[in-house]
């Protein structure tokens, strides 16, 4: 990880843009910790493995989280 320091948040910018759940490879929700005082959401896209930081406060991102958790609950027995 570049620019590594003991206390550092990963997200430099956060995106409000809607993300198509089908284009997602992985969605990481990193809780607040001693390293970063806020929740961070990092989406890994299928296209070229691009990683994008998402705004947890954005309506579009909240909808994405709902859609992903709904999809997960469908899959789990």
């Amino acid at each position: 990880v570049p620019l590594s320091r003991t206390v550092r948040c990963t997200c430099i910018s956060i995106s409000n843009q809607p993300v198509n759940p089908r284009s997602l490879e992985k969605l990481e929700i990193i809780p607040a910790s001693q390293f970063c005082p806020r929740v961070e959401i990092i989406a890994t896209m299928k296209k070229k493995g691009e990683k994008r930081c998402l705004n947890p406060e954005s309506k579009a991102i909240k909808n994405l989280l709902k859609a992903v958790s709904k999809e997960r609950s469908k899959r789990s027995p």
Partner: antibody, heavy 124, light 107 residues
Framework: QVQLVESGGGVVQPGRSLRLSCTAS????????MHWVRQAPGKGLEWVAI????????DYAASVKGRFTISRDNSKNTLYLQMNSLRAEDTAVYYC?????????????????WGQGTTVTVSS | EVVLTQSPGTLSLSPGERATLSCRAS???????LAWYQQKPGQAPRLLIY???SRATGIPDRFSGSGSGTDFTLTISRLEPEDFAVYYC????????FGGGTKVEIK
């Protein structure tokens, strides 16, 4: 439209201070990391400093560390560069630039919007 | 710090020709951390490529980026008159640094 406008440049004596400002419009300033980049006359680009979208972290080029401070006021859509103990080699055009949407320490989207620059001349 | 060396320093070509610009890093960097910019005299730089190979919004498809590790390339497939400018590579694998630039001039 999306725009960055720098101000505050001028002629200053060695050892003195100067504060640059960069005013953003046309986008949600509070969700983007921001940079300062400079270009000495007839030379290439030199990265100066970065600040995270919420001001939680900063980083500096070795050449300015301890002398320059980057800060932001998200309520005013404004980025700042406080420059102390100025030297002749700090003479340059200073640009503010926006970090790409969703950039992180794991993936970099480049500096996608730039201001027109403000000129700083350090001379006695 | 990661040092980026661009070559050649100057490239003299005619409109319609192919331009190949090189950027070499002093240590290996992830392709996700490399960008290319174009700068014309008296203007601010413009982002062309991020993530070593992804075109920025509004950039024509004659511009393409490739490479990994320590060697990266910007290719302009057919030079248009407006493409004559200085090109910089930039990395963010550690504190950001720019290469020294390649000037593409009209032959």
């Amino acid at each position: 439209q999306v725009q960055l406008v720098e101000s505050g440049g001028g002629v200053v004596q060695p050892g003195r201070s100067l504060r640059l400002s960069c005013t953003a419009s046309g986008f949600t300033f509070s969700t983007y990391g921001m940079h300062w980049v400079r270009q000495a006359p007839g030379k290439g680009l030199e990265w100066v400093a970065i600040i995270w979208f919420d001001g939680s972290n900063e980083d500096y080029a070795a050449s300015v560390k301890g002398r320059f401070t980057i800060s932001r006021d998200n309520s005013k859509n404004t980025l700042y560069l406080q420059m102390n103990s100025l030297r002749a080699e700090d003479t340059a055009v200073y640009y503010c630039a926006r970090e790409g949407d969703g950039s992180s320490l794991y993936y970099y989207y480049g500096m996608d919007v730039w201001g027109q620059g403000t000129t700083v001349t350090v001379s006695s | 710090e990661v040092v980026l060396t661009q070559s050649p320093g100057t490239l003299s070509l005619s409109p319609g020709e192919r331009a190949t610009l090189s950027c070499r890093a002093s240590q290996s960097i992830s392709s996700g951390y490399l960008a290319w910019y174009q700068q014309k005299p008296g203007q601010a730089p413009r982002l062309l490529i991020y993530g070593a190979s992804s075109r920025a919004t509004g950039i024509p498809d004659r511009f393409s980026g490739s490479g990994s590790g320590t060697d990266f390339t910007l290719t302009i497939s057919r030079l248009e008159p407006e493409d004559f400018a200085v090109y910089y590579c930039q990395q963010y694998g550690s504190s950001p640094t720019f290469g020294g630039g390649t000037k593409v001039e009209i032959k």
